[in-house]
């Protein structure tokens, strides 16, 4: 058993069954020796009396909140919360695989630029009786800060019969360096707590291979005199770090129709123009990645061709 | 070319080669992003490895207001990988596939620490750690870890030199 | 399987013109950008221009302008390439070759003799 | 117009051997470059596009690396069937254009 937070403890369980359970020990917190009596959530029938109380907690039903009183009056409380571990697995009920970029990914996470602030998202079926804390680090054995903010409820989606839910969190590193080379990851830990079922969640990385720059702004086109060809040009992203001549991008340029399947004309450049080839009904579409280090490309940015 | 008086370096002809050395790094590795490689205790192989750090001057201002700590720790930094690379590490069993971008790679990390460093001239160079690791699968891990760390070496490298290039050419 | 086939070999005098089909099989014509590439003997490849069957559009190397034509026909599934003014230095095997994407050429058709001889 | 320029203009390699082909491009054009492989009497087959994205169907020991202004198409371990002129094309900019090729011949 341990401590989550001030009054709130986490049993860990081997969850199989007939599993013997953990022998827990709770302690009124109170200078009174006598007369005290304790009760689990909202019922009234006193599990027993003295300044500890002694339970065996083996399944849900012996989780909760755990009530010491003294002539009617509450002394203080103990949450109790269970972590499962099955066939030593840590539960992973609460959040739903992402499945990307590998199995077992439960959080997400993307930075727009090198400026040490990102974002994590994660994905859940459950909508209410539901909190999550999120902590972070550069490094573990000799952490360095990172701030995050309070998770929140960012979209909701239908998928067939069940609503998704998907929170996200900010984080910013206290004392980021944009131009260094990273060399220990960032730490993110979830604690995800829904009704009286405790799971955590962790992913580590750099923040160089979680980059995702933002679509380029301000396409523009400008046919060319006698030819099918039309200059298109672009601007970096407002987001993306300063200056361009260190943090540069490179991007891809394509022309194509509304369907996947149909004829396109495409090219790669470090510039932030390119000339090719409209064609009616289809659009052109500039993406940008990391000159200098394959992290993800940006969202596309389009334009009409007309 | 980057002296011991302090001169410049050849910025555009060290832009060039480090921007092929990322090219390279990432042909040599391309699906390195796929492979969690912190999983598998990745503090004491790539620990001893030169990362350009924080106070190394190899961000904009840092370069502007002299350019030769970094360039230096860019030296330190190319030699150590190309030791490594020329070592048993890379040249040991498993055998590299043939088409395997590892001897290129090689040839340009040599090229552009020549390039930074003139004959007659030395700086200082980093003692290579002894990781000879006894079991091929620890062999070919430990390529991946030094492949991936090479991977984000050059790219704070190419920066430097696109920077350069861009702004401190005569 | 998508192939393009080529009519046969021709022989002209100088100053004349040539015109050469390429007919489309295993895919909608419209579908691909259709480009012509010539070889002259022993020596290597020469891009001439594109055409986008879905809507006429041209494009020709600087080189070609005003020279070549390129055309299709979508009710037979055939590209056409007319070379006028030939000169001896024409003397090429000419290749029409496509792709869904304009900058490279994914198939390729079997090639055309043209000898310019006077 | 840009300036493609391959080397060696040939290549004499012993079957099972690693062949390595260049093209240079006389301006920096990103990785738009392509590979094909023509065969005496035969139309050019293409084996990479984008400077190294192989394409399915040919064999994997064909390989392609480079960006701006120089690339390489590696041969891993020739075989009988790989005897052929190799040329670069570059779709940076129109006029699309070819390099002179490189022709891997027996040693």
């Known amino acids: 058993i341990w401590e989550l937070k001030k009054d709130v403890y986490v049993v860990e369980l081997d969850w199989y069954p007939d599993a013997p359970g953990e022998m827990v020990v709770l302690t009124c917190d109170t200078p009174e020796e006598d007369g005290i009596t304790w009760t689990l959530d909202q019922s009234s029938e006193v599990l027993g009396s003295g300044k500890t109380l002694t339970i065996q907690v083996k399944e849900f039903g012996d989780a909760g909140q755990y009530t010491c009183h003294k002539g009617g009056e509450v002394l203080s409380h103990s949450l109790l919360l269970l972590h499962k571990k099955e066939d030593g697995i840590w539960s992973t009920d609460i959040l739903k695989d992402q499945k990307e970029p590998k199995n077992k990914t439960f959080l997400r996470c993307e930075a727009k630029n090198y400026s040490g602030r990102f974002t994590c998202w994660w994905l859940t079926t459950i909508s209410t009786d539901l909190t999550f804390s999120v902590k972070s680090s550069r490094g573990s054995s000799d952490p360095q800060g990172v701030t995050c903010g309070a998770a929140t409820l960012s979209a909701e989606r239908v998928r067939g019969d069940n609503k998704e839910y998907e929170y996200s969190v900010e984080c910013q590193e206290d004392s980021a360096c944009p131009a260094a080379e990273e060399s220990l990851p960032i730490e993110v830990m979830v604690d995800a707590v829904h009704k009286l079922k405790y799971e955590n969640y962790t992913s580590s990385f750099f923040i160089r291979d979680i980059i995702k720059p933002d679509p380029p702004k301000n396409l523009q086109l400008k046919p060319l005199k006698n030819s099918r060809q039309v200059e298109v040009s672009w601007e970096y992203p407002d987001t993306w770090s300063t200056p361009h001549s260190y943090f540069s991008l490179t991007f891809c340029v394509q022309v194509q129709g509304k369907s996947k399947r149909e004829k396109k004309d495409r090219v790669f450049t470090d510039k932030t123009s390119a000339t090719v080839i409209c064609r009616k009904n289809a659009s052109i579409s500039v993406r940008a990645q990391d000159r200098y280090y394959s992290s993800s490309w940006s969202e596309w940015a389009s334009v009409p061709c007309s | 070319r980057a002296v011991p008086g302090g001169s410049s370096p050849a910025w555009t002809q060290c832009q060039q080669l480090s921007q092929k050395l990322c090219t390279l790094a990432w042909s040599a590795h391309p699906l390195v992003g796929h492979m969690d490689l912190r999983e598998e205790g990745d503090e004491e192989t790539t620990n001893d490895v030169p990362h350009i750090q924080c106070g190394d001057g190899c961000d904009p201002q840092g370069l502007r207001d002299n350019s030769q700590f970094c360039l230096q720790r860019i030296h330190q930094g190319l030699i150590f990988y190309e030791k490594l690379l020329g070592s048993d590490i890379f040249t040991g069993e498993p055998s590299l596939l043939p088409d395997s971008p590892v001897g290129q790679l090689h040839a340009s990390l040599l090229g552009l620490s020549q390039l930074l460093q003139p004959e007659g001239h030395h700086w200082e160079t980093q003692q290579i750690p002894s990781l000879s690791p006894s079991q091929p699968w620890q062999r070919l891990l430990l390529r991946f870890k030094i492949l991936r760390s090479l991977q984000a070496f050059v790219a704070v490298a190419a920066r430097v030199f696109a920077h350069g290039a861009a702004t401190l050419s005569p | 399987q998508v192939q393009l086939v080529q009519s046969g070999a021709e022989v002209k005098k100088p100053g004349a013109s040539v015109k050469v089909s390429c007919k489309a099989s295993?895919?909608?014509?419209?579908?691909?950008?259709l480009h012509w590439v010539r070889q002259a003997p022993g020596q290597g490849l020469e891009w001439m221009g594109w055409?986008?069957?879905?809507?006429?559009?041209?494009e020709s190397a600087p080189k070609f302008q005003g020279r070549v034509t390129m055309t299709t026909d979508t009710s037979t599934s055939t590209a056409y390439m007319e070379l006028r003014s030939l000169r001896s230095d024409d003397t090429a095997v000419y290749y029409c070759?496509?792709?869904?994407?304009?900058?490279?050429?994914?198939?390729w058709g079997q090639g055309t003799m043209v000898t310019v001889s006077s | 117009e840009i300036v493609m320029t391959q080397s060696p203009a040939t290549l004499s390699v012993s079957p099972g051997e690693r062949a390595t082909l260049s093209c240079r491009a006389s301006q920096s054009i990103s990785i738009n470059l392509h590979w094909y492989q023509q065969k005496p009497g035969q139309a050019p087959r293409l084996l990479i596009y984008f400077a190294s994205q192989s394409i399915s169907g040919i064999p994997a020991r064909f390989s392609g690396s480079g960006s701006g202004t120089e690339f390489t198409l590696t041969i891993s371990s020739l075989q009988s069937e790989d005897f052929a002129v190799y040329y670069c094309?570059?779709?940076?900019?129109?006029?699309?254009?070819f390099g002179g090729g490189t022709k891997v011949e027996i040693k």
């Open positions: 055409i986008d069957p879905e809507n006429g559009d041209t």
């Open positions: 070759a496509a792709n869904k994407e304009l900058r490279y050429f994914d198939v």
């Open positions: 094309q570059q779709s940076n900019s129109f006029p699309l254009t």
């Open positions: 295993g895919y909608t014509l419209t579908d691909y950008y």
